[in-house]
Interface confidence: low
């Protein structure tokens, strides 16, 4: 045991991280026939190689390139759902609407979802005690750089109409500092993407305000239109009914506004 170890502000690597990544990889490749060719041991080796023995504040997108290459996956570019601060509902939606995909429905997103990891400079150890916090320690940490890399690639792949689910309960419905606001918005390709459609999810039962008029949504609209992409916005007043109607679109109550 080293006598001195860097204490970071964030939680340490998720317990059983190597086993979890390998297990998730095997699960994913078994379920998705188009990914059956993927060798999960190689995927783990590439994942490990991105951060092991490296200073956890000096990680670059380049470090993840071998993993990106192994995890290359084609998803229908017109079936992409982005999300910001409302992950659970986005995932519930794609669980029902099977032909749409969030980043976490791809191999690389699925592998890393909800996990934390980091190593230590010049040792092959995984740091289970603490990892750098994006705000308090450094932004170029293994987890942040991973999500920045895969989010950029995911947005770059999008085409036609791209959907984004936003949390209407937050003070900043669109947050320029979120992964969506800082990475994905800027990597949508205007020559491929025709429209970004925002779905603003209401939290309150009696909330009938038009959150598409929120100043932060207007900010998003101007950023998007400056990038030569059309913008549209819909209020989802009843997220529970919304999901129910995705499951059973023929239900008579689904013709009314949700």
């Amino acid at each position: 045991v080293p006598r001195w170890r860097q204490q970071w502000s964030g939680p340490g690597t998720t317990k059983r991280f190597p086993e979890t990544v390998l297990a998730r990889c095997v699960k994913y490749t078994e379920i998705h026939p188009e990914m059956r060719h993927v060798d999960c041991q190689s995927v783990w080796d590439a994942f490990k190689g991105a951060f092991i023995s490296k200073h956890p504040c000096n990680i670059t997108e380049e470090d993840y390139q071998p993993l990106m290459k192994l995890g290359t996956q084609t998803v229908p570019c017109n079936k992409i759902l982005l999300w910001s601060r409302i992950k659970d509902l986005a995932h519930q939606f794609t669980q029902v609407q099977r032909d749409m995909f969030t980043l976490e429905d791809t191999l690389l997103g699925y592998l890393a979802d909800d996990l934390t990891w980091c190593g230590e400079f010049n040792t092959s150890k995984i740091n289970y005690q603490s990892c750098p916090d994006w705000r308090k320690d450094c932004s170029n940490n293994p987890v942040s750089v991973f999500w920045k890399t895969v989010s950029r690639r995911f947005a770059e792949a999008a085409c036609d109409v791209v959907h984004v689910m936003l949390n209407g309960s937050r003070s900043k419905i669109f947050d320029k500092n979120s992964t969506f606001g800082s990475v994905e918005v800027h990597n949508l390709q205007p020559e491929k993407v025709q429209t970004l459609e925002a779905w603003v999810i209401h939290g309150g039962r009696e909330d009938s305000r038009d959150l598409c008029q929120d100043p932060t949504i207007k900010e998003l609209e101007s950023i998007i239109s400056k990038r030569n992409i059309q913008f549209s916005c819909k209020n989802i007043y009843r997220p529970d009914k919304f999901l129910q109607c995705v499951k059973n679109p023929e239900d008579s109550s689904c013709t009314s506004e949700i």
Epitope: T20, V26, K27, I31, D88, H91, Q95
Partner: antibody
């Protein structure tokens, strides 16, 4: 009809070995992840081991059996195995083999009737 | 590993009554939770998967709800054949799969 049928249980002394089998029928065996789950007398369910589809390149074990138990599959015989070595009294249980749902979620949708293993001197 | 805590340990009810069984996870398991029924001398049977989807052939008096850490299984009207032990299982953080300790639904 989709069916799993375990065999190979019995009485064994501590430190002994047993090999359990699970014969599958009514479905394409190679396409499914398979599991062993056990239940000690009067107790709840405990996951023991899993094996990946096809050739079973990947296997996983509960910490309590790691290094002592080995899961394997013979797809030509549609059979799942559990080789149990260095058996202990606490391994006494009904052992079930279970098929995992071949969907985006991984609950166990088909179970065998179980085979009883008793470890005692 | 994720610990699942089921409550109550035993539920004493009469046929025709409504039963609500709870399962709490020690950390977020999204919707990756299943419910099983086990009768004496029999293997477990899958009732509900992905927290709220009924398995094939399961009567609609069984329903599941919840996500994250708190889940429940409801039997709207207990039939005589529903008296059994019920287990929840998570398959989000894996390995290992973990099961709850079980809730016994017995005849009052």
């Amino acid at each position: 009809e989709v069916q799993l049928l375990e065999s190979g249980g019995g009485f064994v002394q501590p430190g002994g070995s047993l090999r359990l089998s699970c014969a599958a029928s009514g479905f394409t065996f190679t396409n499914y992840v398979m599991n062993w789950v056990r239940q000690a007398p009067g107790k709840g369910l405990e996951w023991v081991s899993s094996i990946s589809i096809s050739g079973g390149r990947y296997t996983w074990y509960a910490d309590s059996v790691k290094g002592r138990f080995t899961i394997s599959r013979d797809n030509s015989r549609n059979t799942l195995y559990l080789q149990m070595n260095s058996l202990r009294a606490e391994d006494t249980a009904i052992y079930y083999c279970a098929r995992e749902m071949n969907t985006y979620s991984f609950p166990m949708d088909v179970w065998g009737q179980g085979t009883t293993v008793t470890v005692s001197s | 590993e994720i610990v699942l805590t089921q409550s109550p340990g035993t539920l004493s009810l009469s046929p025709g009554e409504r039963a609500t069984l709870n399962c709490r996870a020690s950390q977020n398991v999204r919707s990756d939770l299943a419910w099983y029924q086990q009768k004496p001398g029999q293997a477990p049977r899958l009732l509900i998967y992905d927290a709220s989807n009924r398995a094939t052939g399961i009567p609609d008096r069984f329903s599941g709800s919840g996500s994250g850490t708190d889940f429940s299984l409801t039997i709207s009207r207990l039939e005589p054949e529903d008296f059994a032990v019920y287990y929840c299982q998570q398959y989000y953080d894996w390995p290992p799969y973990t099961f709850g300790g079980g809730t016994k639904v017995e005849i009052k």
